[in-house]
């Protein structure tokens, strides 16, 4: 049994770190492997990770953590059975997935404008909660080609647009993404979209 | 808010004994290591006691086998057992989250060892 | 045991001048692991720099940490009359654990 894929592991700077690898051939994850994992701390403790399956020969494993900080460094150490198979280390600083923003929402009643309204996935204690931008992405159910996105740089997890800037008549559904420039974060994942119907009144034309 | 609150100071005699504890709120307590640093009257700051998420424990050399630290993630509360004290124990001692380094402080709690 | 040592014990200054204060290590300490903090009387201390040069949450940038390997330095750029304070360098060792150096005081001239 031998590692084809070497782990590589991304953190959600809070307390889960993913990591994920690719072995020579069909494994079943869970029995065969397990994933130590160790913060390089005098007051920390060894930490055993279960691996699940990830494809046939994929394995995938969330490491729980304590809350990170930048200078956190983890020792891996993956076994099967009494036989190391590798050795590596992990700093979660360096690899960063933000978690996804939740709670999305389309406030409609505001004459003529869309305030799009989510959280913040982060607590107010944690470093990257101060340092969040997003993407939101709104389309069409209708028409694909009508797609569209709003980088929102700064800290507010809000975007008011016109409702002018989409049709009428029709309905879109919108996502919200997260990154961090601080860390050069890979964005998170979208959060679950949310539907609207997008009307407003026309403006009189003046003769 | 990150808050932490100190109790359980006072006047002791020397050999005698003190339980402080720490009230923490605001942040997920059974996810951070804890310590105690405690300040000499006029004095620097002095490290203590640490814990670690897994109750693993460190003690200055100053303390060793007299203090004993300890924690509950269920009442997010910290605590130092001080046994045989002395009067060079007489300080604020306060409550730290932190791991390299102590980003959030309590108060402090005044122990004054003193016949 | 690594021991810091700050200088100078006592730093006179007036408002609107630069503070530059000194942490010496009597052996090398990573950089990630070297704190200063800022302590007012009746006060708990108060982090501001991590990782020799990172700024806490909240902290002005007036304030700035440098340096490595054995010699660190808190600058303050200009003085405002809230930052007359004594100051705290603070390292972290795996093996010995944590040290305080013994403090600058920052008065007013």
């Known amino acids: 049994m031998k590692v084809l894929q070497e782990p590589t592991c991304v953190s959600d700077y809070m307390s889960i770190s993913t990591c994920e690898w690719k072995m020579n051939g069909p494994t079943n994850c869970s029995t065969e492997l397990r994933l130590l994992y160790q913060l390089v701390f005098l007051l920390s403790e060894a930490h055993t990770c279960i691996p699940e399956n990830n494809g046939g020969a994929g394995c995938v494993c969330h490491l729980l953590m304590d809350d990170v900080v930048s200078a956190d460094n983890y020792t891996l150490d993956l076994w099967a059975g009494q036989q190391l198979l590798w050795k590596g280390s992990f700093k979660p600083s360096e690899h960063v997935k933000p978690r996804a923003p939740g709670n999305l929402t389309v406030h409609t009643n505001v004459s003529d404008t869309l305030l799009l309204t989510w959280s913040n996935p982060y607590p107010p204690d944690n470093y990257l909660y101060n340092h969040l931008t997003y993407a939101v992405n709104i389309w069409s159910e209708n028409d694909p080609a009508d797609f569209r996105i709003y980088n929102v740089t700064y800290l507010e997890p809000s975007l008011r647009i016109a409702a002018s800037t989409l049709k009428s008549g029709i309905s879109y559904r919108a996502r919200v993404r997260a990154w961090a420039q601080c860390y050069n974060t890979t964005w998170s994942e979208w959060s679950p979209s949310t539907k609207w119907h997008n009307s407003y009144r026309e403006p009189f034309e003046q003769h | 808010e990150v808050q932490l609150v100190e109790s359980g100071g006072g006047l002791v005699q020397p050999g005698g004994s003190l339980r402080l504890s720490c009230a923490a709120s605001?942040?997920?307590?059974?996810?951070?290591?804890m310590f105690w640093v405690r300040q000499a009257p006029g004095k620097g700051l002095e490290w203590v006691s640490g814990?670690?998420?897994?109750?693993?424990?460190s003690y200055a050399d100053s303390v060793k086998g007299r203090f004993t630290i300890s924690r509950d993630n269920a009442k997010n509360s910290l605590y130092l057992q001080m046994n045989s004290l002395r009067a060079e124990d007489t300080a604020v001692y306060y409550c730290a989250r932190g791991r390299y380094y102590f980003d959030y402080w309590g108060q402090g709690t005044l122990v004054t060892v003193s016949s | 045991e690594i021991v810091l040592t700050q200088s100078p014990g006592t730093l006179s200054l007036s408002p609107g001048e630069r503070a530059t204060l000194s942490c010496r290590a009597s052996?090398?300490?990573?950089?990630?692991?070297l704190a200063w903090y800022q302590q007012k009387p009746g006060q708990a201390p108060r982090l501001l720099i991590y990782?020799?040069?990172s700024r806490a949450t909240g902290i002005p940038d007036r304030f700035s940490g440098s340096g490595s390997g054995t010699d660190f330095t808190l600058t303050i750029s200009r003085l405002e009359p809230e930052d007359f304070a004594v100051y705290y360098c603070?390292?972290?060792?795996?093996?010995?654990?944590?040290?305080f150096g013994q403090g600058t005081k920052v008065e007013i001239k």
């Open positions: 814990i670690g998420t897994g109750g693993a424990t």
């Open positions: 990782g020799a040069s």
């Open positions: 052996q090398s300490v990573s950089s990630s692991y």
């Open positions: 605001g942040f997920t307590f059974s996810r951070n290591a």
């Open positions: 603070q390292q972290y060792d795996h093996s010995a654990g944590w040290t």
